[in-house]
């Protein structure tokens, strides 16, 4: 007789999840020799230990501490790029500007990027059928708690000028409920961070509005200023040209506004 299984509202664990995480770990440590001290088997065992046999609505940051310890990584604290609702462009940027880092350029972010996972209470099984949805089921699910934990640590590590890429095509360019708005903004350390510089990415080719005047950007400025961190904002009117100019800064067309 098959056991009754909780049906959650979200998609189930990504297929071949253990092998995918391990494959990413092995590849990451090959590309980044400074992380060769990492044992990918231990990383997987710690990752698994954070959610296996636990109720998927009762996961805590504490559950992920063994994994956080194993994945400890030093990135240049003044080269951090945060992003909100514009992941692909942020990643394209750091692929070109190799001295800057998004969370997904770190080992732990790279391991989990775009994956879903959860277990079941009191069984060692991974649930490939369904996992809790943050809104419909519970916020303390394995995926949400993981990203909250690593995002908090990433923001805490930042110093000097921190950049954030924001999506100017969204109704809320700055969203207080995003990971950036609810976690990262509040964990920047005022004693280390001098300025948060927002890059607002325009969507339409003919969009010449100053989106730095958007009410949600003003709200972000207010939150940041209250935390004794300076705020600056730039419009990126042409993201395609922006990337091109990062690749080829000497290009004559790159002196004008992008």
């Amino acid at each position: 007789v098959p056991r009754w299984r909780q049906q959650w509202s979200g998609p189930g664990t990504t297929k071949r999840f253990p092998e995918t995480v391990l494959a990413r770990c092995v590849k990451y440590t090959e590309i980044h020799p400074e992380m060769r001290h990492v044992d990918c088997q231990s990383v997987w065992d710690a990752f698994k230990g954070a959610f296996i046999s636990k109720h998927p609505c009762n996961i805590t940051e504490e559950d992920y501490q063994p994994l956080m310890k194993l994945g400890t990584q030093t990135v240049p604290c003044n080269k951090i790029l945060l992003w909100s609702r514009i992941k692909d462009l942020a990643h394209q940027f750091t692929q070109v500007q190799r001295d800057m880092f998004t969370l997904e350029d770190t080992l732990l972010g790279y391991l989990a990027d775009d994956l879903t996972w959860c277990g079941e209470f009191n069984t060692s099984k991974i649930n490939y059928q369904s996992c809790p949805d943050w809104r419909k089921d519970c916020s303390n699910n394995p995926v949400s708690v993981f990203w909250k934990t690593v995002s908090r640590r990433f923001a805490e590590a930042a110093c000097d000028v921190v950049h954030v890429m924001l999506n100017g095509s969204r109704s809320k360019i700055f969203d207080k409920n995003s990971t950036f708005g609810s976690v990262e903004v509040h964990n920047l350390q005022p004693e280390k961070v001098q300025t948060l510089e927002a890059w607002v990415i325009h969507g339409g080719r003919e969009d010449s509005r100053d989106l730095c005047q958007d009410p949600t950007i003003k709200e972000l400025e207010s939150i940041i200023s209250k935390r004794n961190i300076q705020f600056s904002c730039k419009n990126i009117y042409r993201p395609d040209k922006f990337l091109q100019c990062v690749k080829n800064p000497e290009d004559s067309s790159c002196t004008s506004e992008i």
Epitope: R16, P18, E19, L22, A23, R24, V26, K27, T29, E30, M35, R36, H37, V38, D39, C40, Q41, S42, W44
Partner: nanobody, 118 residues
């Protein structure tokens, strides 16, 4: 208990080939990342290569890339290292281990000696 038994080493001329094997027992082989590590005379242990449980990803130290190939047969609980175009610098005692590339060096076999010399 965990047992790892390496074999396949020997004396070979520069440019030659060898295939090392590691027979594993005492644990669920198909669940584990596996690696090859080597120790040259008078030197510390050096990581050589790593493979994931399902074999979908492999990694190599720079000096062996394009020459060595790690593989595994989970049905036979065996790890392999195909070594081509061998160089004198590859002379070492070769061990397989659970995990990798880094981490604690817990479980070891006796190793298999590879000597590259003309």
């Amino acid at each position: 208990q965990v047992q790892l038994v390496e074999s396949g080493g020997g004396l070979v001329q520069p440019g030659g080939s060898l295939r090392l094997s590691c027979a594993a027992s005492g644990f669920i082989f198909s669940d584990k990342v596996m690696s090859w590590v080597r120790q040259a005379p008078g030197k510390g242990r050096e990581w050589v290569s790593t493979i994931t449980p399902g074999g979908t990803a492999t990694s190599y130290t720079e000096s062996v890339k394009g020459r060595f190939t790690i593989s595994r047969d989970n049905a036979k609980n065996t790890l392999y290292l195909q070594m081509n175009n061998l160089k004198p610098d590859d002379t070492a005692l070769y061990y397989c281990r659970i995990g990798g590339p880094g981490g604690r060096y817990d479980n070891w076999g006796q190793g298999t000696q590879v000597t590259v010399s003309s």
